[in-house]
Interface confidence: medium
């Protein structure tokens, strides 16, 4: 998977009036990495691993960047026409990626009240608008505002692309993201199901990177996909991931079943507790 940096900013308006403040989260390689603390007006690392990425450096640069982005997004929301009474949101998601072959991708997406209405490839500066007519109108609003000063806009988007990649490379240089492999902790539990059956659940937690194989086996053979239930692979807030797989088996057959886990070239099997 490519290395990625993802900015997620949201600003709000009430009865057409843009509210002060903004919400911001930054994800590094899919993990919660930074959050803007509105009480302290500071960018704050999300967990120990995020602090380790920058070591003892301050987060002034991140605070300045997020504050600037929040201000820009508030200005954009202020230029959206025909805002209904009540509460409305404008969300911007910006992503940059560095792939294994060193190629890069950058994109930006705008959502109004949760509906995607405008995307831009920051490298080619190509805009994409969904087919819905509301999206077309919103996109026209925002693009009209953003292109008022064409040269400034061109510079702005080039800078967005370059800045995002520069930050991503800076974080990767710490080595914390690039080198680390954290093996999963695997835990198998059982619970009563219908009469004569039990549900066995295999949980893998605190692993990195996110790619993992977790499956139930009977007599050493993997069960079919439709006899198992899988949970999503989700961040656990500590820079690592968690997931689970469950299946239903007959009571008394427990010794025939094992949970198989494969992660970063290592694998292990885990029996059902008696």
């Amino acid at each position: 998977e490519p290395h990625s940096l993802r900015y997620n900013l949201t600003v709000l308006s009430w009865d057409g009036s843009v509210q002060s403040g903004f919400l911001a989260e930054v994800h590094l390689d899919g993990q919660p990495f930074l959050r803007y603390d509105r009480q302290k007006c500071r960018a704050k690392p999300q967990g120990q691993w995020a602090e380790d990425v920058l070591g003892n450096k301050t987060w002034d640069r991140e605070t300045r960047d997020l504050t600037g982005n929040g201000k820009d997004l508030r200005m954009t929301l202020a230029h959206i026409k025909d805002q209904k009474e009540g509460l409305h949101s404008l969300q911007e998601i910006r992503v940059c990626e560095i792939h294994e072959d060193n190629s890069t991708r950058s994109s930006q997406h705008f959502y109004y009240d949760g509906e995607l209405f405008l995307s831009q490839n920051l490298e080619t500066e190509e805009w994409t608008v969904p087919q819905s007519s509301r999206a077309q109108t919103l996109a026209m609003n925002v693009r009209n505002f953003l292109k008022e000063d064409a040269m400034k806009t061109k510079t702005h988007y080039h800078a967005m692309h370059a800045d995002c990649l520069q930050e991503l490379r800076r974080y990767l240089e710490s080595g914390v993201v690039l080198r680390r492999t954290v093996p999963p902790m695997v835990n198998v539990t059982r619970s009563e199901a219908s009469e004569g059956n039990i549900t066995v659940t295999c949980r893998a937690s605190s692993f990195y990177p996110r790619n993992i194989i977790l499956t139930w086996r009977q007599d050493g053979v993997s069960l079919s996909h439709d006899t198992q239930q899988w949970g999503d692979v989700l961040p656990d807030g500590n820079g690592t991931y968690q997931t689970w797989v469950a299946t239903r088996i007959c009571r008394g057959e427990e010794q025939r079943f094992t949970c198989y886990m494969e992660h970063s070239g290592n694998h292990s099997t885990h029996p059902v507790p008696s």
Epitope: A78, K81, Q136
Partner: antibody, heavy 118, light 107 residues
Framework: QITLKESGPGILKPSQTLSLTCSFS??????????VGWIRQPSGKGLEWLAH???????YYNPSLKSQLTISKDTSRNQVFLRITSVDTADTATYYC??????????WGQGTTLTVSS | DIVMTQSPATLSVTPGDRVSLSCRAS??????LHWYQQKSHESPRLLIK???QSISGIPSRFSGSGSGSDFTLSINSVEPEDVGVYYC?????????FGGGTKLEIK
């Protein structure tokens, strides 16, 4: 009290340029979210939206007439203007200006009538 | 462009009747639908905003309903001063378009 009032030439010949003025009071076009638009209505027919200008000078035009239309404003004098080039008999109508905020036209002028005749 | 279709074109009613005027959009416009009343030799005035929201100063006998592409303006007890033409308007997306109108007459 919010009022809008349209003024125009009354009669034009085909191919001439129509210049309309909307003078308003009770609100300001420097207020965020505020806009003023033009709508016309041929006698005995329905309403057709023509153009719109916003507080930030963003302009919208009806695509079917865009090449003929120019909307502008003088914020300090509380006026909005509409120019329609190369008028034809089909442009004979009553022209209204209306305030638009939060998505709808909430105040309308009394209208000004244009007759295009050779 | 979103096409707004109103029906019926003309409606003849007796004072006190409850009437319903229909407006249909050619595609979904959520609740971005506004109703206007235009009396003879007057400019239009806003009756209902966002499909069902009332407007200050408009009599409570006027109400609106609907969402998506089908909308209704109801007058629950028609009075003689309600005669005129009623227009619906797409406020959802550019260009803003009006229906052809429904003319309300008193028998």
């Amino acid at each position: 009290q919010i009022t809008l009032k349209e003024s125009g030439p009354g009669i034009l010949k085909p191919s001439q340029t129509l210049s309309l003025t909307c003078s308003f009071s009770g609100f300001s076009l420097s207020t965020s979210g505020m806009g003023v638009g033009w709508i016309r209505q041929p006698s005995g027919k329905g309403l057709e939206w023509l153009a719109h200008i916003w507080w930030d000078d963003d302009k919208y035009y009806n695509p079917s007439l865009k090449s003929q239309l120019t909307i502008s404003k003088d914020t300090s004098r509380n006026q909005v203007f509409l120019r329609i080039t190369s008028v034809d008999t089909a442009d004979t109508a009553t022209y209204y200006c209306a305030r638009r905020t939060q998505g709808y036209f909430d105040y309308w002028g009394q209208g000004t009538t244009l007759t295009v005749s050779s | 462009d979103i096409v707004m279709t109103q029906s019926p074109a003309t409606l003849s009613v007796t004072p006190g009747d409850r009437v319903s005027l229909s407006c249909r959009a050619s595609q979904s416009i959520s609740d971005y639908l506004h109703w206007y009343q235009q009396k003879s030799h007057e400019s239009p005035r806003l009756l209902i905003k966002y499909a069902s929201q009332s407007i200050s100063g408009i009599p409570s006998r006027f109400s609106g309903s609907g969402s998506g592409s089908d909308f209704t303006l109801s007058i629950n007890s028609v009075e003689p001063e309600d005669v005129g033409v009623y227009y619906c308007q797409n406020g959802h997306s550019f260009p803003w378009t009006f229906g052809g109108g429904t003319k309300l007459e008193i028998k």
